[in-house]
């Protein structure tokens, strides 16, 4: 069966949208009005991993681009990236783990939490136009509490 | 503040090898997508290859593409380009750039001659 | 191999605004291709005037903008000074596969 996806975009907390600067630039920043138009929007697939009532395994590609989000051991520390992939074999449903999120709601508040590496987050920076980063700390200085809304097809 | 250092440079023949490095400082080098750059005498800038934050994605220029690898040690704060098989039209300042587009100061670069 | 085309030479009258733009032999340009503008003056490194088709670099006079118009990228400069004469670059990103990023052959502006 064909994974499940959906699309969507997601903003921290602080409702800072995440927009793309560059090819591999992902960065969080305040939008308004017609500059919302500029946030990614992501294509989240329900994929194999441990799953529990509140802990959810997905992957987040960016709608239409052959990039993921990826999580990689980088000179000895766990660091998230944009990876290209083959969009001829992505996305499936037993994604590599590097590719896996435990999406994690809590309070109406969503975490992603790295399945690859357990207790780091998907984070964003308090300071605006700032990479979104993989983080090992919660409920710190930098932001890993997000909102999703949901984008029609 | 933002700051990009680049060395390696220097006078080599055809065929011959150079390590360039990019020490990056004033900014969260672990984070960014960094990019390399070079200017031949007289000519306009050239886009010679960039890197994502882990390594696992690179691009380069078609002009270098099989002779240069680009990588970067964020533990160190590092960015390095490798140039092997060096061409006589490789000879310019590389620049080290934030960002895959290039979007940052630019540093005074380091000049590469490639002459026999 | 796609080449990025800019006007060699322009001109303009202190004060006048002029439009400075970036194409692509084949094809339009669009936000996917994450235009950049360049400033140099001879003997200087180049400066990053806008980024990601219309963000302007720190330090940036609000006097530079970009903006895709039609298929093309766009630098426009408003009230221009007698310091911006210079060479002015744009590159774009070839996500067709090559994944590199290829800057034009630049625009000479004269203020006159």
């Known amino acids: 069966a064909p994974v499940r996806s959906l699309n969507c975009t997601l903003r921290d907390s602080q409702q800072k949208s995440l927009v793309m600067s560059g090819p591999y630039e992902l960065k969080a920043l305040h939008l308004q009005g017609q500059d919302m138009e500029q946030q990614v929007v992501f294509s989240m697939s329900f994929v194999q991993g441990e799953e529990s009532n509140d802990k959810i395994p997905v992957a987040l590609g960016l709608k239409e681009k052959n990039l993921y989000l990826s999580c990689v051991l980088k000179d000895d520390k766990p660091t998230l990236q944009l990876e290209s992939v083959d969009p001829k074999n992505y996305p499936k449903k037993k994604m590599e783990k590097r590719f896996v999120f435990n999406k994690i709601e809590i309070n109406n508040k969503l975490e992603f939490e790295s399945a690859q590496f357990p207790n780091w987050y998907i984070s964003t920076s308090q300071a605006e136009n700032m990479p979104v980063f993989l983080g090992g700390t919660k409920g710190g200085q930098d932001i890993t509490d997000f909102t999703m809304q949901f984008v029609s097809s | 503040e933002v700051q990009l250092l680049e060395s390696g440079g220097g006078l080599v023949q055809p065929g011959g090898s150079l390590r360039l490095s990019c020490a990056a400082s004033?900014?969260?080098?672990?984070?960014?997508?960094m990019s390399w750059v070079r200017q031949a005498p007289g000519k306009g800038p050239e886009w010679v290859s960039g890197?994502?934050?882990?390594?696992?994605?690179?691009g380069y220029a078609d002009s270098v593409k099989g002779r240069f690898t680009i990588s970067r040690d964020n533990s160190k704060n590092t960015l390095y380009l490798q140039m092997n098989s060096l061409r006589p039209e490789d000879t310019a300042v590389y620049y080290c750039?934030?960002?895959?587009?290039?979007?940052?100061?630019w540093g005074q670069g380091t000049q590469v001659t490639v002459s026999s | 191999q796609t080449v990025v085309t800019q006007e060699p030479s322009f001109s303009v009258s202190p004060g006048g605004t002029v439009t400075l733009t970036c194409g692509l032999s084949?094809?339009?340009?669009?936000?996917?291709?994450?235009p950049g503008w360049f400033q140099q003056t001879p003997g200087q490194a180049p400066r990053t005037l806008i980024y990601?088709?219309?963000n302007r670099h720190s330090g940036v006079p609000s006097r530079f903008s970009g903006s895709i118009l039609g298929n093309k990228a766009a630098l426009t400069i408003t009230g221009a000074q007698a310091d911006d004469e210079s060479d002015y670059y744009c590159?774009?990103?070839?996500?067709?596969?090559?994944?590199?990023?290829?800057f034009g052959g630049g625009t000479k502006l004269t203020v006159l």
């Open positions: 990601n088709t219309n």
């Open positions: 750039a934030k960002d895959w587009m290039a979007t940052t100061p």
């Open positions: 084949s094809g339009s340009v669009t936000t996917n291709n994450y």
């Open positions: 890197i994502n934050t882990g390594g696992g994605s690179t």
């Open positions: 004033g900014f969260t080098f672990s984070t960014y997508a």
């Open positions: 590159a774009l990103y070839m996500s067709s596969g090559s994944n590199n990023a290829v």
